[in-house]
């Protein structure tokens, strides 16, 4: 028997520095977690103790903090090289700055293979990107070889900016011939490493003949066997065993997100490449693991540029940006409108001639807007200003919801109106009218939404049985502020870009902003 240790991360999202337990900015260092310096300590410890170790990343290193905003992926290549990753799969967020924003900082600089079997380049891009990412890679590990085959969510064109010269194929259809190729090359230990979410990971384990292990990402799935060490609730045991259609027992793993855990899976193979046992658990990277001093010093060196950036002007406002709780928790506020407009703008993807865009709607809990921005400071808006407005380090995500769920959400928005509670919704691409004289749960008297399948966008009544795409904070997608109906009834959830980054990019693009209160949210006469 031959034993392989797979160390894995996924959805790190720019968390190069240690973070608090909820993966936001580290405040009390003695209780902070993760970060590449701490990760390196643990990886090195395992490499020293065990003979056959692979360190893999399942995508979405890009996007999530000011590190990515400033360094645009150069930081990913640099620190992943320093940690000596063995392979990485492309995630959807790796395309956030377009294909160029992937090629130059990461693909050309990485000293490890970057993989995806289901992304096919065409046109002029084909020769430009040739060899910079691969469908698979055969890695020597000790006296053996291990094949790693990559995959990426086929929804990437709706979630990021891969352009028109990359085709995202069905994962299973694309993976099978590559795995077959590895088999003909006498590679009998094959890991599928990719970024399509836990459901697809399980399908790959079930359907792709010859895959021995699946290491996934995208859905931030936390798996654990036994008592979990922190706040995350396991979605299943680690590893999660899937029985393939032909009867193989395939371990599937994922390691939550944000570099909080290091996935640790031990696989025992026989001489024929049969998996005869698998066990492990994610390792919580808490403060009991010291940060590696040399990596930490490097982080501090790279950090300097971030501090300078946060005080630089992004753009100007010529109006007061009203982000006060007195406004945003009671009525339409122009800060809410600005943020929602930025959220929609960030999700412009013209992928179908029938649609002007794939999504037109935004909702945002008023309680998530934490500060106004005064225009009487020469109109200057900085990252620092935006960090005061959006201090929680969340993301603006894409969900699919039925109209009936949206109606419930808007009823919840005003179910206890007047108490300055955070659930009051700010909107974009939505016109809502409330009648507060009616009983809670029956206060939405009009709800019109902006069409997407149209050449001239216009507002139509919400249809209860129709499925709509909506951009919203991850806080709401996870049921925050009492929006349990969103969490329980959402049909799809893809995590998006860092909230501050979305707004800062929009302001930089617009240069001068002047958001108004324009009648998106109304109260019917006599009730307000």
């Amino acid at each position: 028997a031959w034993e392989l240790t797979i160390l894995h991360t996924n959805d790190v999202h720019s968390r190069l520095e240690q973070t608090s337990e909820d993966s936001s900015k580290c405040v009390n260092a003695s209780r902070c977690m993760g970060g590449v310096a701490r990760l390196f300590t643990k990886v090195q410890q395992i490499r020293r103790a065990e003979p056959n170790v692979l360190l893999l990343d399942a995508g979405d290193q890009y996007q999530g903090t000011i590190w990515f905003t400033v360094y645009k992926g150069a930081e990913v290549a640099h620190f992943m090289n320093a940690l000596r990753y063995d392979a990485m799969a492309l995630g959807n967020h790796e395309f956030d700055n377009g294909v160029e924003g992937l090629i130059e900082p990461l693909l050309k600089e990485a000293k490890f293979p970057i993989l995806s079997a289901n992304i096919k380049a065409k046109g002029p891009l084909a020769s430009q990107i040739s060899g910079l990412y691969l469908p698979y890679k055969v890695l020597p590990v000790g006296d053996e070889v291990v094949g790693i085959v990559g995959y990426t969510s086929k929804e990437t064109p709706f979630l990021s900016n891969p352009g028109t010269n990359l085709v995202f194929e069905d994962e299973i259809t694309a993976l099978q011939p590559e795995v077959d190729k590895l088999k003909t090359l006498n590679v009998n230990k094959i890991i599928a490493l990719g970024h399509s979410g836990f459901e697809m990971d399980k399908l790959i384990a079930q359907k792709v003949r010859g895959v021995d292990v699946v290491v996934g990402g995208h859905s931030n799935t936390f798996l654990y066997t036994g008592n979990p060490p922190s706040k995350e609730v396991p979605a299943g045991k680690y590893p999660f065993i899937v029985t393939s259609d032909d009867g193989r027992k395939v371990p599937v793993v994922q390691a939550y997100a944000f570099g909080k855990y290091l996935g640790y899976l031990k696989i025992e193979f026989d001489e024929r490449g049969n998996v005869i046992s698998s066990h492990g658990n994610p390792i919580l990277l808490n403060s009991s693991i010291p940060e590696d001093p040399s990596i930490k010093a490097d982080i501090n060196k790279w950090r300097i540029k971030l501090d300078n950036y946060s005080t630089q002007e992004l753009g100007k406002t010529i109006v007061y940006l009203d982000g006060s709780s007195q406004s945003c928790r009671f009525r339409e506020c122009n800060m809410g409108n600005l943020i929602c407009d930025a959220m929609i703008n960030n999700n412009l993807r013209h992928t179908d001639e029938m649609f002007w865009n794939h999504v037109s709607m935004c909702i945002l809990n008023g309680g998530g807007i934490r500060s106004p921005i005064d225009e009487r400071n020469n109109g200057t808006i900085t990252w620092e200003n935006l960090a005061a407005v959006l201090p929680f380090g969340g993301t603006f995500d894409l969900v699919q919801l039925k109209g009936s769920t949206l109606k419930k959400a808007f009823e919840h928005s005003v179910h206890r109106y007047g108490q300055s509670t955070g659930e009051f919704l700010q909107v974009g691409g939505i016109h809502v009218v409330y009648d507060l004289s009616r009983k809670p749960g029956d206060r939405v008297v009009k709800l019109d939404v902006l069409c997407t399948k149209c050449r001239v966008p216009s507002y139509d009544p919400l249809k209860m049985d129709e499925v709509y795409k909506v951009i919203l904070p991850n806080f709401l997608a996870n049921g925050g502020d009492g929006f349990q109906m969103i969490k329980d009834e959402l049909l799809r959830h893809d995590s998006g870009d860092q909230d501050i980054n979305v707004v800062s990019t929009y302001i930089s693009k617009m240069k001068v902003i002047y958001p108004a209160v324009e009648g998106r949210i109304k109260f019917s006469t006599g009730s307000h």
């Epitope: 010859g210 259609d245 032909d246 027992k249 025992e268 026989d270 024929r272 049969n274 005869i276």
Partner: antibody, heavy 119, light 107 residues
């Protein structure tokens, strides 16, 4: 070395049941499927089904569904195949074999257990 | 279920002869084809897996080839100990199925 040792020959009456055992040694019993294959006198090989001792998952062919039960006792590394409602055409040599799941070949076989069904 | 058809059902050959046995599947089995040798009163023995890969300890005079639905077992120079019955088996789709066997007899 890796081996599978089966229980001895059985003579049964029609309508009765038979339970054949297969003891594994020399490898991780819970890591491989145990396949059951039978061979009627002068005939070819016929796959009946399989069990994965690691979680007692089973696969049976349509022909034997409802009549065959495969079990395993991991504490003694032994797999069992029970065939009920025996008929005379169930007279055969019953083999257990270890299945390799990369190609679904059977690389280690038991010596076979002869089951005779006769009134 | 996938049907496996072997030909010939039996053949007579002499020591030193080159012997070829074919196996046809009722559908594409993607090279998941295994060959076994069985001697009277004994359990089958694995010779070749995945069309052409020799199982450990099997002499190199045995070889396999084929793709799609048609596969071949070749014994380059028949030895006295090779007189036996040979079975093919597909490992592509459950239920696993065997060919009816080819008996190799002494001429």
């Amino acid at each position: 070395q890796v081996q599978l040792v089966q229980s001895g020959a059985e003579v049964k009456k029609p309508g009765a049941s038979v339970k054949v055992s297969c003891k594994a040694s020399g490898y991780t019993f819970t890591g491989y499927w145990i396949q059951w294959v039978r061979q009627a006198p002068g005939q070819g090989l016929e796959w009946m089904g399989a069990i994965y001792p690691g979680d007692e998952d089973t696969r049976y062919t349509q022909k034997f569904q409802g009549r065959v039960t495969m079990t395993a006792d991991t504490s003694i590394s032994t797999a069992y195949m029970e065939l009920s409602r025996l008929r005379s055409d169930d007279t055969a040599v019953y083999y257990c074999a270890r299945g390799n799941w990369d190609d679904w070949d059977f690389d280690v076989w038991g010596q076979g257990t002869t089951v005779t069904v006769s009134s | 279920d996938i049907q496996m058809t072997q030909s010939p059902s039996s053949l007579s050959a002499s020591v030193g002869d080159r012997v070829t046995i074919t196996c046809r599947a009722s559908q594409d089995i993607s090279n998941y084809l295994n060959w076994y040798q069985q001697k009277p009163g004994k359990a089958p023995k694995l010779l070749i897996h995945y069309t052409s890969r020799l199982h450990s300890g099997v002499p190199s005079r045995f070889s396999g080839s084929g793709s799609g639905t048609d596969y071949t077992l070749t014994i380059s120079s028949l030895q006295p100990e090779d007189f036996a019955t040979y079975y093919c088996q597909q490992g592509d789709t459950l239920p696993w199925t065997f060919g009816q066997g080819t008996k190799v007899e002494i001429k």
